[in-house]
């Protein structure tokens, strides 16, 4: 089964897509007459011919779109100009601006908090299972198993720092070698990119917004997957990461540093710790085969404890079991010895919602998962709405220009590298790549940041999270310092290697093209986004995990044919687009395959049938529900009440190509006004200048 868009009678498409050499927004030829073009004051760029703007893995060529969906929308200003306002209007507008800013920061705060709670929820639901993944002895000999365990564990606990810290403690305890830990770290890198992909799903309501947001989020996924695809075999063959990091660790006499500063946590922790507090040590203990930990709850009950080391008298079966001969005595019947015990006295309970409920971890996790996703979704909708009303006209022009414009020639190439540094710096400040990339996603969706600019920011974010890990490693206690530092450096050099592979030469920026391809597919078939998430982050890793447990022979027996078919399809795709004449007539297109193998249309019909029961009912509940429904059922008619999914689809129902919502309208409300769907509000009161 090939999850591709329509192949139909498509012939290899001779049309080339153009991309700015320095990572500009792709510009379709002659768009000057279009209303939704990007700011035409942009500096001219060197153009290079590239493959189609969708995934290089895609088997088809879609008909050339009249309108390039990757152009940033022009967020037009519907309000009165500042100069035309009277004093009262200016004061009102100023306070409106302040109000919007406060609201934006408030929603942003709860957005970040909900990400933290989401991570806790995932840990409660799957943390113990994640810990058990680590206790598998095959990790040592099978790098592929290590990789998928890294992915699965990080997806289950929604935190690469948690999975990395488990790996560090296992290496420190000699349960794992650094060599065996490297693939797990690579997997953790992949797993952490699921968060912003989930966030992108929340923007499913608007097709064009979703296209950009999902592509912007999955550019991170593709970078990580492609890096692993190349670097894992290289590491297995050469052990270059292990060798380089070992040399660095051995050449420096590191002194224990201080903990990496918790900058964002300082603000979010007071709120998140009122919701739930977790005992993260439990997952590590399970990973290290501690049987008692399996029955412990992850929900922290006691926050203030007093640990007292004391010696107690214990009976032993015989004198041979005594701590030492001098610490052995008898009462005439039993033999006694003295044992050092650490007595933990509970002093004060934690102050969070679930402290007195005594619910099982799964129940608490499920509750928090649902609530955090709802808050995440709600905050995201509000952030997008506020940004949509603020980022219009001059404000939008200035911001978009600042973010997306390159340095003047000949320093244009430096812009991307500055973006990498900005991404690294911002991630270092917020102490989480998930938070940074998740905050970036809605900005890509609403068209403030181009995917070409988001890409280096994301790469920088990957670097930023490793510098945090290096600082944390330097703060480790003596016995864990070497191993934690070496693993943190492995993570760092892995990301550096990935950047060197997929960034410096514009031609090698495959993640952008692959993400755009996926964005196009997902905008047309929105269920495919969920399908992608399940396949790449759960099914593939779980399949590899299962096959690895079955043994090398089974893994190779199944894996080699699959890899061979994928390579064959990619080679054939490449030949079809580049030099179709060398191929036999039959292989010049995909028509020889049954429709279900070359098109998503039959699959769409199956999904639509399966989700048909939701189409007329679910959406009228609320905006959030509608977004969930639209994601599942891809239905243009299901949102008559909330109007949140309407995408001018009635007019284009028959078309196969992804359709972009008219971006001439500055926001949903205005676009609906134009369509006569909602009563026009008094747009004169709209205030845009901050």
């Amino acid at each position: 089964m090939a999850p591709w868009p329509e192949l139909g009678d498509a012939q290899p498409n001779p049309d080339k897509y153009l991309e700015g050499a320095a990572g500009q927004q792709p510009t379709a030829p002659d768009k000057s007459k279009e209303t939704n073009k990007t700011d035409n004051t942009e500096a001219p760029v060197t153009k290079i011919e590239l493959l189609p703007s969708y995934s290089t893995a895609t088997l088809i060529d879609e008909p050339t779109e009249v309108d390039d969906p990757w152009n940033l929308p022009t967020l037009q200003d519907s309000g009165i100009k500042w100069s035309e306002r009277d004093t009262k209007g200016k004061i009102l507008c100023f306070f409106q601006g302040i109000g919007r800013l406060i609201l934006l920061l408030g929603f942003l705060y709860f957005f970040v908090c909900s990400l933290d709670i989401l991570s806790s929820a995932f840990q409660l639901v799957g943390g113990k299972m994640a810990g058990q993944f680590f206790s598998n002895s095959s990790i040592m000999s099978n790098p592929l198993l290590g990789l998928v365990i890294g992915v699965l564990v990080t997806v289950l606990v929604q935190s690469s720092s948690t999975s990395t810290s488990i790996v560090v403690s296992m290496v420190s305890s000699s349960l794992l070698t650094v060599r065996a830990a490297i693939p797990i770290i690579m997997g953790a890198n992949i797993g952490t990119s699921i968060t912003n992909t989930i966030v992108a799903l929340m923007q499913v309501g608007d097709r064009s917004e979703f296209r950009r947001a999902f592509a912007g989020a999955t550019v991170h996924d593709f970078f990580n997957w492609l890096s692993v695809l190349v670097l894992l075999p290289v590491e297995v063959a050469t052990h270059y990461l292990e060798i380089i990091t070992q040399l660095i660790v051995e050449s420096f006499h590191f002194k224990n540093g201080e903990d990496a500063p918790d900058l964002l946590k300082v603000i979010t922790k007071p709120f998140t710790k009122l919701i739930v507090q977790l005992d993260k040590k439990v997952i590590s203990q399970i990973a290290m085969n501690d049987e008692k930990a399996k029955n412990k709850s992850l929900v922290k009950i006691w926050c203030k404890t007093f640990t007292n080391k004391t010696q107690i008298n214990v009976t032993v079966p015989s004198t041979a079991n005594c701590t030492s001969p001098s610490l052995c005595w008898t009462d005439g019947i039993q033999n006694w010895t003295m044992k050092n015990v650490t007595y933990k006295e509970n002093i004060a309970k934690c102050q969070h919602i679930f402290v007195n409920f005594h619910l099982p971890d799964l129940a608490v996790g499920t509750i928090l998962l649902i609530l955090s996703l709802l808050v995440l979704c709600g905050c995201l909708i509000m952030i997008v709405k506020i940004l949509g009303s603020v980022l219009k006209g001059q404000v939008a022009t200035v911001i978009k220009k600042t973010i997306n414009t390159d340095f003047p020639f000949p320093f244009a190439w430096l812009t991307g590298y500055l973006a990498i540094l900005v991404g690294a710096g911002m991630t270092f400040i917020v102490q989480s790549s998930s938070v940074f990339t998740s905050a970036l996603t809605p900005l890509i969706g609403i068209g403030v940041i181009t995917i070409e600019r988001a890409y280096p920011l994301t790469l920088g974010s990957n670097i930023g999270t490793t510098t945090t890990a290096i600082l944390a490693a330097l703060a480790s206690p003596g016995n864990a310092l070497r191993s934690s530092l070496q693993i943190a450096l492995c993570h760092f050099f892995f990301n550096i290697s990935g950047i060197l592979l997929w960034y410096p030469i514009p031609f090698t920026r495959l993640p952008i093209r692959m993400a755009k391809g996926l964005g196009n597919i997902s905008a047309k078939y929105r269920w495919f986004a969920v399908f992608y998430l399940i396949i790449f982050f759960f099914l593939i890793p779980l399949t590899v995990f299962g096959l690895s447990l079955a043994g090398w022979r089974v893994l190779v027996g199944v894996g080699v044919p699959v890899v061979f078919i994928i390579i064959l399809v990619l080679c054939l795709r490449l030949l079809q687009s580049r030099c179709p004449r060398v191929l036999p007539k039959k292989l010049q297109n995909w028509n020889f395959l049954p429709l279900w193998m070359r098109s998503l249309k039959p699959w769409d019909a199956v999904v639509s049938k399966f989700t048909g029961c939701f189409q007329m009912r679910c959406c009228c509940c609320c905006r959030v529900c509608c977004r969930a429904c639209c994601l599942l059922c891809d239905c243009p008619k299901c949102c008559r009440c909330s109007k949140c999914c309407e995408d001018l689809e009635e007019a284009q129902e028959g078309q196969d190509v992804p359709v972009k919502a008219p971006e001439t309208f500055d926001n949903i409300t205005i676009s609906r006004e134009a369509q006569g769907e909602v009563p026009a509000s008094d747009s004169k009161t709209e205030c845009t200048a901050l």
């Epitope: 052995c328 005595w329 019947i333 006694w336």
Partner: antibody, heavy 120, light 107 residues
């Protein structure tokens, strides 16, 4: 207060057996180990064995194993020691004693002793 | 079995004198040693346990020390009522064993 009252003196023939008692009061009988110690005339002390009345667990000095039986009757708070196959060298004062110092074999309360004379 | 060798077997001293009785174990017994006092015609009485811990009601002129194999009972200032036989006992291993005893007399 803790009291251990032992049965009266016995004169027995060699090869016979003797069963003496130790009635306790002033403490919870099942709480502490009951030790039996003997002292031959003008000699030192010799530990025979101990019983934990709570569970009936016993421990014996290998020297007496097979000849001595320690029992305890919880209903009357009385401990018993039976010594069989008596020999002349078994002539001694037999003490019952308890250790209220938990987990130690240091005995702090003693009965007045039962003199057993083995004579033909 | 662990042998407890007590010395001297008897001693005669004056009232107010310092009396030292030693006890040697045949193997390491840690600090699991007790001392008893037995007056003629009476049952033994516990003086010290855990080598140096005085039992309730025992005068502070009695003290104990040592560890491993060598142990000492000291009567700081001998009183007439202290005339008795003193026994050491180990409770490190079963069977519990006692020393031969030291008879203390006043000149």
């Amino acid at each position: 207060q803790v009291q251990l009252v032992q049965s009266g003196a016995e004169v027995v023939k060699p090869g016979a057996s003797v069963k003496m008692s130790c009635k306790t009061s002033g403490y919870t009988f099942i709480t502490y180990n009951m030790h039996w110690v003997r002292q031959a005339p003008g000699q030192g002390l010799e530990w025979i064995g101990a019983i934990y009345p709570g569970s009936g667990d016993t421990s014996y000095n290998q020297k007496f194993k097979g000849r001595v039986t320690l029992t305890a009757d919880k209903s009357t708070s009385t401990a018993y020691m039976e010594l069989s196959s008596l020999r002349s060298e078994d002539t001694a004062v037999y003490y019952c004693s308890i250790s209220t110092i938990i987990t130690t074999g240091a005995v702090d309360y003693w009965g007045q002793g039962t003199l057993v004379t083995v004579s033909s | 079995d662990i042998q407890m060798t007590q010395s001297p077997s008897s001693l005669s001293t004056s009232v107010g004198d310092r009396v030292t009785i030693t006890c040697k174990a045949s193997q390491d017994v840690g600090t699991a040693v007790a001392w008893y006092q037995q007056k003629p015609g009476q049952s033994p009485k516990l003086l010290i346990y855990w080598t140096s811990t005085r039992h309730t009601g025992v005068p502070d002129r009695f003290s104990g020390s040592g560890s491993g194999t060598d142990f000492t009972l000291i009567i700081r200032s001998l009183q007439p009522e202290d005339v008795a036989t003193y026994f050491c006992q180990q409770y490190s291993r079963i069977p519990l064993t006692f020393g031969g005893g030291t008879k203390v007399e006043i000149k």
